[in-house]
């Protein structure tokens, strides 16, 4: 029986009975939050062989091993993952071993085994036999291996039954529990699976098979399952489904969506039966089972029951995420907020059309309206009293509407109104009239020339850069000295700079009136000598990184009610010089014959320029006499050699470990202080753990579908 679309067993261990007839779980399996420490030995699900998505175990009291529950679980496909993981075992208080002795393949995703205080037999499993890449596995905070004393079958009797492999330079027996070896296929099978008797399976089999070289005898399929056979691709008129089997059109048409009862049903696209059209595609009609490409972003129509949607916080903006057409009116009233500009862009940046009016009032947190970065049409089907479809009133810090050089916005019907926006220059409003096609609609009082822009330097002169010099982490720039009509009006200059991979930034990007600003700012005093050009050295920059820089003259903005001139430069794009790259990451070497080494690595995290080649150096090492000094046949005589495992459980380090005796009177020495890089790595590690935990808790405590 195929069970699905995902099984969530929580709070009551008896819910496990839902797995009774499952051979394949099409979806995920969650077993979590079970408080009663029951005897799970009476629960056994030998039929279950495949989970197509992921397996998550979290806080299940009393469960000591998974081997009795799932003795034949062979493949976890990882078609969908839980935060990049196909197997998650987290905070399992009583789990002593994993015990999934028939688990042969995790097709996609990594494993995360964390905070299981009693869990052993982790170092005895060779995950590289199960997963393609082990570098993303996260195994931390479990029972320390030295407290485990893991012994594979037969080791005590000096008749070891399990095979050996090398992990982290350690050649050892591989097993799941004290009486279950980890299965390995003969090298002659290559990447193929094998039977219990070590005969090679058919190439289309995955994990195991009941008979050799037979595509109908597979426990699981490498690619797709269809009509009892494992096939490399789905036959004509059948479609891939859930990443593992082939179904026909009728099957696809009749699937009920697990997500919601009123969904439009599944679609067929690119040979696959799927719940929704993929990103960039839309259904070819509401009842269609087929997808067509969208022109630009795919439309998503959002409607407000009460006709007018008030945006007064990030939370209210969140409701508009992904909307491209808003049926109704927008009332924006953002008085305060943290990082508000970029948050609003995140949630409202895709809106292209508003069918009613747009009203922005008392939004003192806004500096610009550029967060509505795709707005191109205000229909004005509904208007405010006075026939206004764009209304901007009392926004104390609003300086820019949009970047009109890169913006097409049409207001189809209705007038504009602007009043009491002291930092918004009237020239900016007149520019909007021209672009939006509303010129001539407004009457005299609709754009107040006295109280708009009264506290701004509106008539801007252009500051010109005179020189730029770069090094790997510095930029030196100078500019013409600005001379306003009265030199006393010039106070200083402010230099704004930020990383800009692309030449598309604007002055108001990410800026709001509450202190959030994506630009770094540096004040530059006037040089005392009037003939010296002002300039600045920007340091602490990244090598081979493009920066955007502009300069503003800081002037007195009001002289007896006359507007005075301000000045600023164009945005200059400048790249720092290249530098030495950081070290290549994850260097691994392995021997595949008596005369060859295969060396693999990942690119450096900071290339600091265009990488053109790598240099690989090697040298022969003398044979280590240490290897010959011990009888390796006797387990207790093996000297303990410590290998760094690269993880530190910060919470478990309680004191400075004593690392060596320094001789003489000195006594024991403390460990060397951590380098900045180590501290940073620890900080990132702790942050990563927290992010995962947040994701886990958030995923588990959610409103369930009705």
């Amino acid at each position: 029986e195929i069970c699905g679309p995902g099984i969530d067993i929580r709070n009551d261990y008896q819910q496990l009975k839902r797995l009774e007839n499952c051979t394949v779980i099409e979806g995920y399996l969650h077993i979590l939050l079970i408080s009663k420490a029951e005897d799970y030995r009476s629960y056994r699900f030998p039929k279950l062989t495949v989970i197509t998505e992921y397996l998550l175990l979290f806080r299940v009291a009393g469960l000591e091993s998974l081997g009795d529950l799932f003795p034949n679980l062979t493949v976890i496909r990882g078609w969908k993952l839980f935060y990049n993981y196909a197997l998650v075992i987290f905070e399992m208080t009583n789990l002593k071993d994993i015990g999934l002795y028939n688990l042969r393949n995790i097709t996609r995703g990594a494993i995360r085994i964390e905070k299981n205080a009693d869990l052993c037999y982790l170092s005895t499993v060779d995950w590289s036999l199960i997963l393609d890449a082990v570098s993303n596995n996260y195994i931390v905070g479990n029972k320390p291996p030295k407290e485990c004393g893991d012994l594979c079958p037969g080791t005590m009797e000096e008749k070891p039954m399990c095979e050996k492999t090398t992990i982290n330079n350690e050649y050892n027996y591989r097993c799941w529990t004290t009486n279950r070896c980890q299965k390995m296929c003969p090298s002659t099978c290559g990447k193929r699976a094998c039977t219990e008797n070590n005969e090679c399976c058919h190439p289309e089999c995955l994990g195991s098979c009941s008979a050799p070289d037979n595509d109908t005898a597979c426990v699981a399929c490498r690619h797709y399952y269809y009509a009892g056979v494992c096939v490399p691709a789905c036959p004509p008129n059948t479609y891939r489904f859930e990443g593992w089997r082939c179904v026909d059109r009728d099957f696809c048409a009749n699937i009920l969506s697990a997500e919601s009862s009123d969904s439009e049903g599944f679609v067929i696209h690119d040979g696959e039966c799927m719940q929704e059209c993929p990103s960039g595609f839309i259904r070819n009609g509401s009842q269609s089972m087929y997808c067509i490409p969208c022109e630009g972003p795919c439309p998503k129509v959002c409607e407000e029951e009460k006709k007018t949607k008030t945006i007064d916080s990030v939370t209210s903006a969140q409701m508009l995420q992904g909307c491209t057409i808003f049926k109704g009116n927008l009332l924006i009233n953002i008085r305060r907020g943290n990082n508000i500009a970029s948050e609003l862009e995140n949630f409202m940046g895709l809106i292209e059309v508003v069918t009613g009016y747009v009203k922005i009032r008392h939004s003192h947190a806004l500096v610009s309206l550029s967060f509505l970065k795709n707005l191109r049409l205000i229909l004005g089907e509904e208007q405010l009293e006075g026939n206004y479809s764009f209304y901007v009133l009392d926004n104390q810090n609003l300086q820019q509407l949009w970047d009109w050089d890169h913006r097409n916005l049409t207001i189809k019907a209705g007038k504009m109104y602007f009043a009491f926006n002291p930092k918004l220059c009237v020239s900016e409003i007149y520019r909007m009239e021209e672009v939006t096609g509303t010129k001539g609609r407004q009457s005299k009082g609709d754009i107040n020339t006295r109280n708009n822009g009264e506290r701004a330097s509106c008539e801007s002169d252009v500051l010109h850069f005179t020189s730029t010099t770069t090094s790997k982490n510095r930029i030196i720039i100078t500019w013409h000295r600005y001379r306003p009509p009265d030199y006393r009006d010039l106070i200083s200059f402010t230099v704004y700079y930020k990383e800009a991979p692309f030449k598309n930034v604007t002055e108001y990007d990410g800026q709001d009136a509450c202190g959030s600003n994506s630009w770094n700012m540096v004040d530059v005093d006037l040089p005392p000598n009037k003939d010296v050009e002002p300039g600045i050295l920007l340091h602490g920059l990244k090598p081979w990184t493009q920066y955007a820089v502009y300069v503003k003259a800081v002037t007195l903005t009001m002289v007896e009610n006359d507007h005075i001139r301000g000045a600023k430069s164009e945005i200059l794009y400048i790249r720092t010089n290249a530098s030495v790259p950081s070290i290549p990451l994850d260097v691994l070497s392995a021997s595949n014959s008596s005369s060859q080494l295969i060396v693999k690595w990942n690119p450096p995290s900071l290339p600091n320029g265009n990488l053109s080649y790598y240099i690989v150096r090697w040298q022969r090492q003398p044979q280590d006499g240490y290897l010959y000094r011990h009888n390796y046949c006797s387990k207790d005589k093996i000297p303990i050699r410590k290998y760094a495992d690269g993880t530190i459980d910060i919470e478990e380090v309680t004191e400075n470990p004593k690392t060596e005796v320094c001789g003489g009177e000195k006594g024991p020495c403390c460990a060397c202080p951590k380098t900045e890089a180590e501290k940073q790595a620890e900080k990132e590690e702790a942050e990563y753990r927290k992010v995962f935990e947040n994701f886990l808790h958030n995923s588990i405590f959610v409103p369930r579908p009705e």
Epitope: N11, D12, L33, I34, S35, R59, A61, E91, K690, V691, E693, N694, F695, L696, H697, N698, I700, F701, V702, P703, R704, E706
Partner: antibody, heavy 115, light 107 residues
């Protein structure tokens, strides 16, 4: 002994702010979700807000969304409820409660409440 | 949001009586239901979770049953210390919601 102690209640004008604290002791604070529940004089219990064990996920009743903020400081073993733009209908005894380790949403330890 | 409705809103009983309080959810909540006891001026106390599991330290005279939408709290033999207000609460989905309470008074 497992204990929760609330503080920070008091009299405030409509529109004002208060910050409630809930000091936890006797258990591993970072392993438990915490909730705030309130009870208006002579009325029943009303759930207000919840923070997940890791502190990364927060949940609110519609009546307080946008005005109240729940947070936790695991180094101090303390949960907080920042209440802004207070209204007359927010008058209540506010209880801090620990959610069960396994039965998320069921509250097995309660504080004495703060008015 | 899921509405929880308790009945009766109050009842009078004598020591030794068997008392039953019911709670109905506006939609199925499986067995994600808790019962609490609250005495005047005191904080609530968890009695039952998972619809039928007794919290630690709760006397065996308290029992819970039901699943889906209909639930019952039974006190098999009312004791003097049991006179209080009882609340049911669902934790099937957020927001968590309580019933309006049932006051058990001395007859």
């Amino acid at each position: 002994e497992v204990q929760l102690v609330e503080s920070g209640g008091g009299l405030v004008q409509p529109g004002g702010s208060l910050r409630l604290s809930c000091a936890a002791s006797g258990f591993t604070f970072s392993s438990y979700a915490m909730s705030w529940v309130r009870q208006a004089p002579g009325k029943g219990l009303e759930w207000v807000s919840r923070i997940s064990p890791s502190g990364g996920s927060t949940y609110y009743a519609d009546s307080v969304k946008g005005r109240f903020t729940i947070s936790a400081d695991t180094s101090k073993n303390t949960a907080y409820l920042q209440m802004n733009s207070l209204r007359a209908e927010d008058t209540a005894v506010y209880y801090c409660a620990r959610e069960s380790y396994y039965e998320w949403g069921a509250m097995d330890v309660w504080g004495q409440g703060t008015l | 949001d899921i509405q929880m409705t308790q009945s009766p809103s109050s009842l009078s009983a004598s020591v030794g009586d068997r008392v039953t309080i019911t709670c109905r959810a506006s939609q199925s909540i499986s067995s994600y239901l808790a019962w609490y006891q609250q005495k005047p001026g005191k904080a609530p106390k968890l009695l039952i979770y998972g619809a039928s599991s007794r919290a630690s330290g709760v006397p065996s005279r308290f029992s819970g049953s039901g699943s889906g939408t209909d639930f019952t709290l039974t006190i098999s033999s009312l004791q003097p210390e049991d006179f209080a207000t009882y609340y049911c609460q669902q934790y099937y989905s957020s927001p968590l919601t309580f019933g309006q309470g049932t006051k058990v008074e001395i007859k």
